[in-house]
């Protein structure tokens, strides 16, 4: 024999103070004749929530057309929900009856509770640049969601991460909790453009997660490479000498000539030029006038890059009338 | 006058998702207390009731079909849809949508659209 | 599922006949009964709502009784325009069912 089925579909309902909460009830049958009644809770003490025959419920609506004969839909959405309407709902059918309706069938009740979103979680890089090759934590946080389940996943440039830790505070029973968590990331020199994202997943954000980025241009240095090289042109009385320093973030560079020892005030041309991945190159002119000197020319290309130590390039004109050989040689 | 129209491919191959839609003029989609639902019927065969969608969103369908089978409204288009997915030859069949009006009873239906699954 | 099972399969019968036919439900559906008339390459078409109920432009001489399990459609006159396949309905349960059908034709 068929027999009347009460659904209500979700076990658990989350609701956030302010909204409507929508409670679904359907039924599998039109018989036995008699109405549904929507209460919390169960027993004696159970309190009624919705009556479609009589009473008032200023904050409750139907879904569906009940004065519809053959209305299988009883679910109710109720308005302005506060923290008093956690609890569990449950549908019944009614027989009806003489000289009252006798309750026939209860649905198996959603449970009302109340759920917080996540605020905006907030990623956090080093104090200090790193170069590559080294690892590096960023921490991503976000506060105020309920209940405590949540899943947060790190990525880099849109592959998933593995190395971090996690943590919910408290890890008792609280109205809100917070989550923290630490990923640890292997630089590369070619991560000036790259990005951190925090990906975070809470029932409340109904499958649509919060993310929060870091972008590893303000964690990365990339150290210069450098280059001192002679045209093998000469202008009369001048040599042409370049100084090249390559692949190098942030831009912040210091760059000055010495000759012989002694440090070069005057102007030199340069210039700087952005690379695909984010990394800059600049290059230097320096003229060296060779027109009444004897004796070797040794030139010094140094570069101050972001507070660091300083880094140095030499090159040694050997002056003859013929130009003899060039030779060079990096100090640190 | 509220009038049903049927739409979709006439032919779908097994294992694929058999989708039609039926578009509602003459009057809102969106209006209660109406009901909305498809019918089919097998060559030769009688009625079998596959779904119904309520006005407000709630979803009933046939229990033998219920794996398969998704009714869904479009209120902006003035439509609603059948999607009924790994068909086999047993899914050849007129696919009739129709409404329910406040009385019981599908008062009015579209002329059907036959669908044969078949590779 | 509840079984409707409509008799007889088919009947031929004279213009201005009373031609009736039933429809037995396998278990108790109040009086929540539909019933439709099919023309060949039609759709079906609403005659009877909740068992004795005439549908909105429908002819008088279509009417229905019945109420739990057992219940008769009766068509009081027989008209040419009235060969076609009749089905019964239950919606008192999910899911819906209809008989198997009563073709009626004219003698």
């Known amino acids: 024999e068929e027999e009347l089925q009460m659904i209500q579909p979700e076990k658990l309902l989350l609701v956030t103070v302010g909204k409507t909460a929508t409670l679904h009830c359907t039924v599998t049958s039109l018989l036995p004749v008699g109405p549904v009644l929507w209460f919390r809770g169960v027993g004696p003490g159970r309190e009624l929530i919705y009556n479609q025959k009589e009473g008032h419920f200023p904050r409750v609506t139907t879904v569906s057309d009940l004065t519809k004969r053959n209305n299988m839909d009883f679910s109710i959405r109720i308005s302005s929900i506060t923290p008093a309407d956690v609890g569990t709902y449950y549908c019944v059918k009614f027989r009806k009856g003489s000289p009252e309706n006798v309750e026939f069938k209860s649905g198996p009740g959603t449970e009302m509770a109340l759920g917080a979103k996540p605020s905006a979680p907030v990623v956090l890089g080093p104090a200090a640049r790193t170069t590559p090759e080294h690892t590096v934590s960023f921490t991503c946080e976000s506060h105020g969601f309920s209940p405590r389940d949540i899943t947060l996943k790190w990525f880099k440039n849109g592959n998933e991460l593995s190395d971090f830790q996690t943590n919910v505070d408290p890890t008792g029973q609280s109205v809100a909790y917070s989550i923290r968590s630490t990923a640890r990331v292997v630089l590369d020199p070619w991560d000036v453009r790259s990005q951190v994202i925090c990906e975070v997943a809470h029932v409340t954000l109904q499958g649509d997660p919060l993310r929060g980025t870091a972008n590893l241009s303000e964690a990365i240095r990339v150290p210069p490479t450098l280059e001192v090289t002679q045209q093998p042109m000469r202008v009369g009385n001048q040599v042409n000498v370049t100084c090249q320093v390559r692949k190098f973030y942030p831009q912040s560079l210091q760059l000055t000539w010495s000759e012989n020892g002694n440090v070069c005030q005057r102007e030199t041309a340069s210039t700087l030029t952005e690379n695909k991945d984010g990394t800059y190159n600049w290059t230097s002119w320096f003229l060296v006038n060779i027109s009444d000197q004897r004796d070797d020319v040794v030139l010094t290309c140094q570069v101050k890059h972001d507070g660091q130590l300083a880094v140095s390039k030499r090159l040694a004109l050997e002056v003859t009338v013929h130009q003899k050989d060039q030779s060079s040689d990096a100090t640190p | 006058q509220v009038q049903l129209q049927e739409s979709g491919p006439g032919l779908v191959k097994p294992s694929q998702t058999l989708s039609l839609t039926c578009t509602v003029s003459g009057g809102s989609i969106s209006s209660g207390p109406a009901y909305w639902s498809w019918i089919r019927q097998h060559p030769g065969k009688g009625l079998e009731w596959i779904g119904t969608i309520y006005y407000s969103g709630s979803t009933f369908y046939n229990p033998s079909l219920k794996s398969r089978v998704t009714i869904s409204v479009d209120t902006s288009k003035n439509q609603f849809s059948l999607k009924l997915s790994s068909v086999t030859a047993a899914d050849t069949a007129v696919y009739y949508c129709?409404?329910?009006?406040?009385?019981?009873?599908?008062?009015?239906w579209g002329q059907g659209t036959t669908v044969t699954v078949s590779s | 599922d509840i079984q409707m099972t409509q008799s007889p399969s088919s009947l031929s019968a004279s213009v201005g006949d009373r031609v009736t036919i039933t429809c037995q439900a396998s278990q108790d559906i109040s009086n929540y009964l539909n019933w439709y008339q099919q023309k060949p390459g039609k759709a079906p078409k609403l005659l009877i709502y909740?068992?004795?109920n005439l549908a909105t432009g429908v002819p008088s001489r279509f009417s229905g009784s019945g109420s739990g399990t057992d219940f008769t459609f009766t068509i009081s006159s027989l008209q040419p325009e009235d060969i076609a396949t009749y089905y019964c309905q239950q919606f008192a349960y999910l899911p819906w069912t209809f008989g198997g059908g009563t073709k009626v034709e004219i003698k």
């Open positions: 129709a409404r329910e009006g406040y009385h019981s009873g599908m008062d009015v």
């Open positions: 909740d068992a004795s």
